[in-house]
């Protein structure tokens, strides 16, 4: 008795975070025996879409010509072979930016910080929001969520970093969002360049130490620690 069919691979090009109005292509790759591919979207009637395979039959293309709120969400794909349907792929979370006006990102006390000192990145929105995200450019896992307790709406979120090391240096942006859809984000804030000065190269903090490390040259995810003063937000990992 053969085991279950291997699950397909699901990905988006040019990426899974897409600005409103831009095009995106979702790809599902299965096996050469695939007869059809099916794409399911969470909380939508199934199948959300289905496509015949492209030659040589091991993948299918699902096109979204213009990104809108309706397309944001969590997707899975399947393929059908002569012996039946595959396992579902791992989920793909398609996020749309541009749903709300852009927040402002600033550094307190300054974007110029000495190694070993503390800095807080402050993301402020014009209207109350309940989720704020901080991302660092060129990080593989860039999203840090701060979500308010009990759905309380906030105008800002603080992302403290202490002690700062050289890996914290780089370009940051933040987004704001409403909790009713984690897949709809604001326009990105203008970029903030965090410059870490210091004569000696700082050692990378080990994961066991109680410090906040930003995603750096080796694509570490942001790992927040400590309290979030004045924001009423709690730290929340997705």
């Amino acid at each position: 008795q053969a085991g279950p069919l291997p699950k397909p691979t699901l990905w988006a090009e040019p990426g899974s975070v897409i600005s409103w109005g831009n095009s995106v292509t979702i790809w599902c790759q299965g096996t050469l025996e695939a007869r059809e591919y099916r794409l399911d979207k969470e909380e939508s009637p199934a199948p959300w879409d289905r496509q015949n395979p492209l030659e040589p039959k091991n993948k299918a293309r699902f096109s979204i010509p213009s990104m809108t709120e309706d397309y944001a969400g969590r997707y899975r794909c399947y393929y059908r072979s002569p012996v039946g349907w595959s396992q579902p792929s791992d989920p793909l979370e398609l996020v749309m930016t541009g749903a709300y006006s852009k927040p402002t990102l600033s550094a307190l006390p300054s974007p110029l910080v000495t190694s070993g000192k503390s800095v807080t990145l402050l993301c402020q929105s014009r209207s109350p929001m309940d989720t704020f995200l901080l991302i660092k450019e060129r990080a593989a896992h860039p999203l840090l969520h701060l979500r308010s307790e009990h759905g309380a709406q906030q105008h800002q979120a603080e992302f403290p970093m202490s002690p700062v090391t050289s890996v914290h240096g780089g370009t940051y942006r933040c987004f704001s969002s409403h909790g009713f859809s984690h897949y709809l984000l604001s326009h990105p804030s203008d970029p903030l360049e965090l410059i870490v000065s210091g004569s000696l190269e700082d050692p990378r903090p080990s994961p066991t130490r109680s410090v906040s490390t930003a995603a750096g040259p080796e694509d570490q995810p942001l790992m927040p620690t400590g309290s979030v003063p004045h924001s009423g937000l709690r730290r929340h990992w997705e």
Epitope: R35, E36, R38, S44, P45, A46, P47, W48, D49, R50, N52, D70, R80, P82, V83
Partner: antibody
Framework: EVQLQQSGAELVKPGASVKLSCKAS????????MHWVKQRPGQGLEWIGE????????NYNEKFKSKATLTVDKSSSTAYMQLSSLTSEDSAVYYC?????????????WGQGTTLTVSS | DIQMTQTPSSLSASLGGKVTITCKAS??????IAWYQHKPGKGPRLLIH???TLQPGIPSRFSGSGSGRDYSFSISNLEPEDIATYFC????????FGGGTKLEK
């Protein structure tokens, strides 16, 4: 009871367009794909295409891509097929058919068909 | 595209008797075949899918079998309401219909 009620017979001139309708009842319209099938007199059936009423996604038989356009009106639970640049080859009975939810079989319920006659 | 050759194109039926219709695919369709009954002025009615699975409410005198490229559909204990046209549909790769079999008295 699931029912697909199709619009009445049409007589149209060559070169014109026509829009056929299929009103669904007895089930949640947006939960099932809707297909369209063509049957010419004395010939077999041909699959034209399908539409997902919940999001408007469509797939077409290559042969009908420039001939048929599928749309839906969710508020009235109605599917439509517009046929353009009609010729005598388009004279046929057209069926709408509900796609099975699991896709284990393509069509589980059909409309009664609409007869289209293209003649000058 | 997969071609479906359905035979015979017409068939005389005797009430209480049995008839068999066959569909031959141009390649292996892996049991992805359905059978429909079609009466004039009505929409086709799904009888069997995936070679032999009867739809709910369909009497057991309808049956299907087969594998690979060759499939058959039978009606036993024929009744007057069985007079209709029957056709097969393969849905392994895309969708292709058989030409139909007209069952006559």
């Amino acid at each position: 009871e699931v029912q697909l009620q199709q619009s009445g017979a049409e007589l149209v001139k060559p070169g014109a367009s026509v829009k056929l309708s299929c009103k669904a009842s007895g089930y949640t319209f947006t939960n099932y794909w809707m297909h369209w099938v063509k049957q010419r007199p004395g010939q077999g059936l041909e699959w034209i295409g399908e539409i997902n009423p919940s999001n408007g996604r469509t797939n077409y038989n290559e042969k009908f891509k420039s001939k048929a356009t599928l749309t839906v009106d969710k508020s009235s639970s109605t599917a439509y097929m517009q046929l353009s640049s009609l010729t005598s080859e388009d004279s046929a009975v057209y069926y709408c058919a509900r796609g099975s939810l699991t896709t284990v079989v393509p069509f589980d319920y059909w409309g009664q068909g609409t007869t289209l006659t293209v003649s000058s | 595209d997969i071609q479906m050759t359905q035979t015979p194109s017409s068939l005389s039926a005797s009430l209480g008797g049995k008839v068999t219709i066959t569909c031959k695919a141009s390649q292996d369709i892996n049991n992805y075949i359905a059978w429909y009954q079609h009466k004039p002025g009505k929409g086709p009615r799904l009888l069997i899918h995936y070679t032999s699975t009867l739809q709910p409410g369909i009497p057991s005198r309808f049956s299907g079998s087969g594998s690979g490229r060759d499939y058959s559909f039978s009606i036993s204990n024929l009744e007057p309401e069985d007079i209709a046209t029957y056709f097969c549909l393969q849905y392994d790769i895309l969708l292709t219909f058989g030409g139909g079999t007209k069952l006559e008295k």
